[in-house]
């Protein structure tokens, strides 16, 4: 008799999830010499232990602590790039500007990027059919709690000038409900972080507005200022040119400073 399975509103665990995590771990530790000491089997065991046999709406940050410990990594605290709703450009940027880091350039972020996972209460099975949706089902699901945990730690580690890339094509350029707006902003440490600099990325050439004057950016400025952190903002009108000038800063057509 087939056992009844909880149907959630979100997509199920990514196909070949265990193999993907393990393979990513091996690849990452091969590429990054400072992480070569990491035992990827132990990392997978800790990852699995965070959600297997647990109700997927009852996951806590504590469940991920063994994984956090194994994935402890030091990145230059003054070279952190946060992003919201514009992941691809942020990643293209750090692929060129190799001394800057998004969360997904760290081991734990790299392992989980674009993946979904959940288990079932009291069974060792991974649920490949469906997983809880943050809005429709529950917020304390394995994926959401993971990103909340690693995002908080990443923001806490930041110092000096922290950059954030924001999507100027969205109706809410700064969204208080995004991971950046709900977690990272509130976990920047005022005693370490001097300035948050926002780069507002424009979507098309016909948009000549100064999006740094957008009401949601003013809201972000207010939140940051109340936390005794300075705020600055730049319009990136031409993201294609921006990336090009990161690659070729000496070119005569790249006179602006990033």
């Amino acid at each position: 008799v087939p056992r009844w399975r909880q149907q959630w509103s979100g997509p199920g665990t990514t196909k070949r999830f265990p193999e993907t995590v393990l393979a990513r771990c091996v690849k990452y530790t091969e590429i990054h010499p400072e992480m070569r000491h990491v035992d990827c089997q132990s990392v997978w065991d800790a990852f699995k232990g965070a959600f297997i046999s647990k109700h997927p709406c009852n996951i806590t940050e504590e469940d991920y602590q063994p994984l956090m410990k194994l994935g402890t990594q030091t990145v230059p605290c003054n070279k952190i790039l946060l992003w919201s709703r514009i992941k691809d450009l942020a990643h293209q940027f750090t692929q060129v500007q190799r001394d800057m880091f998004t969360l997904e350039d760290t081991l734990l972020g790299y392992l989980a990027d674009d993946l979904t996972w959940c288990g079932e209460f009291n069974t060792s099975k991974i649920n490949y059919q469906s997983c809880p949706d943050w809005r429709k089902d529950c917020s304390n699901n394995p994926v959401s709690v993971f990103w909340k945990t690693v995002s908080r730690r990443f923001a806490e580690a930041a110092c000096d000038v922290v950059h954030v890339m924001l999507n100027g094509s969205r109706s809410k350029i700064f969204d208080k409900n995004s991971t950046f707006g709900s977690v990272e902003v509130h976990n920047l440490q005022p005693e370490k972080v001097q300035t948050l600099e926002a780069w507002v990325i424009h979507g098309g050439r016909e948009d000549s507005r100064d999006l740094c004057q957008d009401p949601t950016i003013k809201e972000l400025e207010s939140i940051i200022s109340k936390r005794n952190i300075q705020f600055s903002c730049k319009n990136i009108y031409r993201p294609d040119k921006f990336l090009q000038c990161v690659k070729n800063p000496e070119d005569s057509s790249c006179t602006s400073e990033i």
Epitope: S208, Y237, K241, N248, C254
Partner: antibody, heavy 123, light 107 residues
């Protein structure tokens, strides 16, 4: 030395088609937006079309929208303008022009121009 | 779109004299304005951008001023090679638009 050399102009009947080319040299072509600007005989300058660095964004004046197509081949350092459904009022010298775009600044002017190619639409 | 209006249509000036050309925008274009010179049978040449910055290789006798909606190109002492048509262009709002031109002729 920056050089822009247009070609492909000529006499064409109304409703006909032409493809203009602009060969660029003396600079890194893919670092610049490029535009076509035209000038009817004895008249002023009119911007026609522009294309972004990699050709993924294109822009057109209302007067040519749906009839003209701008494109570029960065491997060949060449800008193109495919002109279909040509009308008498499209008769002009067509210039290709370089735009020194900046990523943190919206607008742009034209810092180098080709010598132009004449397109005559007449029956 | 923004309409650029140049005046006068024709300016008659003697060599060595000062020439003042005006360009007006139908709405503010901040300082996003360029000036071009065009001689018969030739392509336009960039003179001024950012309303007042001379392009590379442009003589100091050419100067630009203004912001918002009113702009001026001044040629302090006209040389024989300066007799040409001059165009202004705004690049503050899409699409970029040109003025109709001012012809500077020998008096």
């Amino acid at each position: 030395e920056v050089q822009l050399l247009e070609s492909g102009g000529g006499l064409v009947q109304p409703g006909g088609s032409l493809r203009l080319s602009c060969a660029a040299s003396g600079f890194t072509f893919s670092f610049y937006d490029m535009s076509w600007v035209r000038q009817a005989p004895g008249k002023g300058l009119e911007w026609v079309s522009a294309v972004s660095l990699y050709g993924d964004e294109t822009y057109y004046a209302d007067s040519v929208k749906g009839r003209f197509t701008i494109s570029r081949d960065n491997s060949k350092n060449t800008l193109y303008l495919q002109m279909n459904s040509l009308r008498a009022e499209d008769t002009a010298v067509y210039y290709c022009a370089r735009e020194p775009v900046s990523y943190d600044y919206y607008g742009s002017y034209f810092d180098y121009w080709g010598q132009g190619t004449l397109v005559t639409v007449s029956s | 779109e923004i309409v650029m209006t140049q005046s006068p249509a024709t300016l008659s000036v003697s060599p060595g004299e000062r020439a003042t050309l005006s360009c007006r925008a139908s709405q503010s274009v901040s300082s996003n304005l360029a000036w071009y010179q065009q001689k018969p049978g030739q392509a336009p040449r960039l003179l001024i951008y950012g309303a007042s910055t001379r392009a590379t290789g442009i003589p100091a006798r050419f100067s630009g001023s203004g912001s918002g909606t009113e702009f001026t190109l001044t040629i302090s002492s006209l040389q024989s090679e300066d007799f040409a048509v001059y165009y202004c262009q705004q690049y503050n709002n899409w699409p970029w638009t040109f003025g109709q031109g001012t012809k500077v002729e020998i008096k």
